[in-house]
Interface confidence: low
């Protein structure tokens, strides 16, 4: 393995070996080795042992290697909304008089117009709009399932608000279900959460588009506010390229530090797409803070400086106890833009573009 | 700003302006700029603004600078674990035949024991063991709040099992509460959650250590599986060196390669405490993978190199179009171990320690 | 139990002031403490509090960056630093200990209070 | 601004029964936080007089009682005495801001 120069692996063990020498004694705060002498000799308490079993369990649990994200998460997305079902559509007839929830429907065949292959879809959300509303409430959604079953999704516990709000819920695994399966109608259940003694379960929370007093308002202003799905996708001919093979790749962490420090921190960079790229084809935004990484990282030698001061520096400069610590971004977020190809414009979203933070690892 | 050679700002701009150039084209999957000629004058369709607001207030609301984490976080966590109340006690009285529901009371003195100060909390879940089950039940946890009252905390959905297991929930927030109010009984309700229109809503799991059966059986054995708190904690002596000022730290992501991959990827390194740093101290375990990252990233010319085949490298080796990418630590998982201090054995978990996949950044 | 602030008196904006709060008849270095203002004719304004190894210290939004509360635990004192003092910052200010180790939920003894004035 | 909501002003007759309210939100009072009372007689310090939303402090006579629901927190006096006139306020930790905040305060005037 080379970079630019040779790589002597050994090392680069032995740096990262006693990094780790520092890093361990650094987050315990010892100075050096705690003394041996006054150690019971046997094996350890049972008491012990359980307590550092639960712990090892939880880390095992909680860690257990995430899915990895496929190749295709690095490119752009394209955005649609679909609207639900009309509320003058018979299909709601039944669902009138249910005092403890509101019904939403959807056609399929409008989903699959927008993604036409399940795998395309990389995130689906539900947004209702709710009026304002003076009332706390905890609200549960659920998905159709079969004929006369529904399918817990999610809650919310929604305090009283004095303007609209709009309410977001993660549904990418039902609509990709949605998708495999053949077209129809599916739908959302948004409930009252009922308790198991209380005898008022009703539905306090009104959402645009739904609720009974509002039902006749269905003009475009209406429209925009009703119930939607907002979906991201890639499309179909950019799909092509994509490989099965999944591969892994970054997404989001924690971060950085004032913009008077030498060492590694964020720095401002604002890209303007015309004079920076001379691009006159992004119509929205016109620009946007990229940002980038700089500063130096030193790598610390704890060999011979097992003390206080240096092993306090660990946590600021090499906190994952690198071999060679290096400034990078540490948490991105992604740009929205709106383009055209030929005349129909396209709002796709770039992952990954701004550089909120940066971090020595 | 310097590292080890003068860095010329202008050209790091100007190498992060045309990565970005790159990024953007690589994730349209475009080989130039689309041609602007046949674009309709005028502004944008109201839809079209319409998706390209929904799209952004969804960045914006996903986004929002996340709680920067204290930098208590670097340092190792005491891990503790405190026991529900035991059910002979008058307290479980009045809650005996209630069908929906079970109750686990904690004595807040106890907790206040392990983790004398709230800000010294890091994570506390509440660990409680299920014992095998054929039915599946859709469950809810709820915290005591006031006389009559209780606060949602958050459901699962348990699926028949075979074997006893472990259901954990993270309860940080409400042993802070704990820990900021007066010392007394607090408790928890572990309910079947009740259906809007079942009228069966009877608790079907059983817990260990509470279901009614097992009640005579409190030995040893069994207090190792009752319910209890998993408490993780800055110890107050380690916590005095600790500046109240925050800065934030990395966490998690996602990832790797092959091991054959010649660029940046995980490189396996086992460290064994004994052998490699020279400590009998540390009791438990023996020792880890560490492993650490290693391999080129090259930076990628896009300004006159715009065609697929290099587009097509930034995914790998640039993601995040940066002006000199580097191999550094993508996920990271801690790291429990055992010592002792005199007499006393302390199990403490190491955050960030164990390095699970590299990324160019 | 008593609680007795010293350090008021009259300073110039942009000045700095540090208020002293000599504690006794409990176990200060197990308690949460706090310090809480009112300007005259003024409702009362919490302004900070500190756990009781000053491990912690939480500050109102209006003071933040200009008060250091700090302990010293074997001279049973708590202490307001107060720097770039405004006109706005006059007020009776009380020490008070803490109905908890945090010093957030509320407190149950209050000092006398002393009054800082700032005027040019 | 006050982040709890007070009445400015009550009054009431030796004997009656007066209610102070103050008003919240889901980060103060509604997010189970426990509130306190205070009483500060004209001139003097503050004294605490409930804590724990509804524990009354030492020495406090059972006339004052508190009480909660929701958001919205009540002290409660009863046989009101001339000796209750004096200015109340509510405090509650808030998890929003991270620190303590005080109603604005209810001047009872005892007529």
């Known amino acids: 393995l080379s970079t630019c120069k040779t790589i002597d692996m050994e090392l680069v063990k032995r740096k990262r070996i006693e990094a780790i020498r520092g890093q361990i004694l650094s987050k315990l705060r010892l100075a050096s080795p705690p003394s041996q002498g006054e150690v019971p000799p046997g094996p350890l308490p049972e008491a012990v042992l359980a307590l550092y079993n639960s712990t090892r369990d939880r880390v095992a649990g909680e860690s257990a290697d995430p899915e990895p994200e496929p190749e295709a998460d690095y490119y752009a997305k394209e955005v649609t909304r679909v609207l639900m079902v009309d509320r003058n559509n018979a299909i709601y007839e039944k669902t009138k008089d249910i005092s403890h929830s509101i019904y939403m429907f959807f056609n399929t065949s409008d989903i699959r117009e927008a993604v036409p292959e399940p795998p395309l879809l990389s995130r689906a959300e539900l947004r209702l709009q709710r009026l304002k509303s003076s009332v706390e409430q905890h609200v549960e959604l659920y998905q159709k399932y079969s004929n006369n079953s529904w399918r817990y999704l999610g809650n919310r516990l929604l305090t009283p608000t004095d303007t609209p709000e709009w309410l977001s819920f993660d549904v990418t695994g039902v609509v990709r279900q949605w998708l495999n399966a053949g077209d129809g109608i599916q739908g959302f259940r948004f409930s009252a959460h009922c308790s198991c003694d209380s005898k008022d379960n009703k539905l306090h929370v009104e959402i645009n588009g739904i609720s009974p007093k509002r039902r006749g308002d269905l003009g475009t202003i209406h429209d925009m506010n009703r119930p939607f799905l907002l979906l991201m996708a890639t499309p179909l001919e950019r799909a092509q390229h994509l490989h099965s093979s999944r591969h892994r790749r970054a997404l989001d962490t924690n971060y950085c530090f004032s913009s008077t420090e030498k060492n590694c921190c964020v720095r401002q960079l604002y890209i303007d797409f015309r004079k920076d790229l001379g691009w006159k084809w992004i119509h929205e935004p016109k620009g946007y803070h990229a940002n980038f990484c700089l500063g130096p990282c030193p790598y610390i030698w704890s060999l011979d400086t097992q003390y206080s001061k240096v092993l306090a520096l660990y946590n600021q400069h090499n906190p994952g106890a690198s071999a060679s610590p290096c400034c990078v971004p540490q948490a991105l977020e992604p740009l929205p833009i709106v383009y055209y190809v030929g005349r129909k414009p396209k709002v796709e979203q770039l992952s990954n573009m701004i550089v909120r933070s940066c971090k020595c690892s | 700003l310097s590292t080890c050679k003068t860095i010329d700002m202008e050209l790091v701009k100007r190498k992060r302006i045309e990565a970005i150039r790159g990024q953007i084209l690589s994730k349209l999957r475009l080989a130039s700029p689309p041609s602007q000629g046949e674009v309709p004058p005028g502004p944008l369709p109201e839809a079209v603004l319409a998706l390209y607001n929904s799209t952004r207030d969804r960045v914006a609301g996903e986004s929002a600078d996340p709680e920067p984490e204290p930098e208590a976080d670097y340092y190792a966590k005491e891990v503790t674990r405190v026991l529900m109340v035991d059910r002979n006690n008058a307290i479980y009285e009045k809650t005996k035949d209630i069908s929906h529901s079970i109750y686990m009371f904690f004595n807040t003195s106890d907790i206040r024991e392990a983790v004398p100060e709230p800000p010294l909390l890091s994570r506390a879940e509440l660990r409680l063991q299920r014992l095998k089950s054929s039915v599946e039940q859709h469950v809810e946890l709820y915290q005591k709040y006031s006389n009559n009252s209780w606060r949602y905390l958050g459901n699962r959905l348990l699926t028949p099992t075979d074997t006893p297991e472990w259901l954990s929930f993270d309860v940080t927030g409400v042993v802070r509460q704990w820990l900021n109010a007066g010392d007394g009984i607090q408790g928890f309700r572990f309910s079947a959650h009740c259906s809007c229109d079942s009228k069966d809503n009877k608790l079907h799991v059983e817990i260990n250590g509470i279901s009614p059966k097992r009640r005579g059986d409190l030995g040893t054995i069994h207090d190792m599986n009752r319910p209890f708190l998993l408490l993780m904690a800055t110890p107050l002596e380690r916590a005095q060196h600790l500046h109240s000022s925050r800065h934030r730290r990395a966490l998690d992501t996602n990832y790797c390669f092959s091991s054959t991959e010649k660029n940046c990827c995980v490189r396996q390194l086992y460290i064994d405490f004994r052998k490699d740093l020279g400590w009998k101290w540390i009791h438990e375990p023996k020792g880890y993978h560490a492993n650490f990252c290693l391999g080129p990233c090259p930076y990628i010319w896009s300004l006159d190199t715009q065609y697929s085949k290099v587009l097509a490298l930034y995914n790998q080796h640039n993601p995040g179009a940066s002006a000199s990418p580097c191999c550094v630590p993508q996920a990271l998982e801690p790291l429990p171990i055992v010592y002792y201090v005199g007499r006393k054995p302390k199990v403490e978990q190491l955050s960030n320690m164990i390095v699970r996949s590299c990324k160019c950044s | 139990l008593q609680l007795v602030e010293s350090g008021g008196g009259l300073v110039q904006p942009g000045g700095s002031l540090r208020l002293s709060c000599a504690a006794s008849g409990f176990t200060f270095s197990r308690s949460g403490m706090a310090w809480v203002r009112q300007a005259p004719g003024k409702g009362l304004e919490w302004v900070s509090a500190?756990?009781?190894?000053?491990?912690?210290?939480y500050y109102a939004n209006s003071v933040k960056g200009r008060v250091t509360m700090s302990r010293d635990n074997a001279k049973n004192t708590l202490y307001l630093q107060m720097n770039s003092l405004k006109s706005e910052d006059t007020a009776v200010y009380y020490c008070a200990k803490g109905l908890v180790s945090s010093g957030l939920n509320g407190m149950d003894y209050w000092g006398k209070g002393t009054l800082v004035t700032v005027s040019s | 601004q006050s982040v709890l909501t007070q009445l400015s002003s009550m009054s009431g007759s030796p004997g009656q029964t007066v209610t102070i309210t103050c008003t919240g939100s889901s980060s103060n009072i509604g997010g189970g936080y426990y509130l306190s009372w205070y009483q500060q007689l004209p001139g003097t310090a503050p004294k605490l007089l409930i804590y724990n939303t509804n524990n009354r402090a030492s020495g406090v006579p059972n006339r004052f009682s508190g009480s909660k629901t929701g958001s919205l927190a009540s002290l409660t006096i009863t046989g009101l005495q001339a000796e209750d006139e004096a200015d109340y306020y509510c405090?509650?930790?808030?998890?929003?801001?991270?620190?303590?905040?005080f109603g604005g305060g209810t001047k009872l005037t005892v007529l």
């Open positions: 405090g509650c930790y808030d998890d929003s801001l991270n620190t303590y905040v």
């Open positions: 500190i756990t009781p190894g000053g491990t912690a210290t």
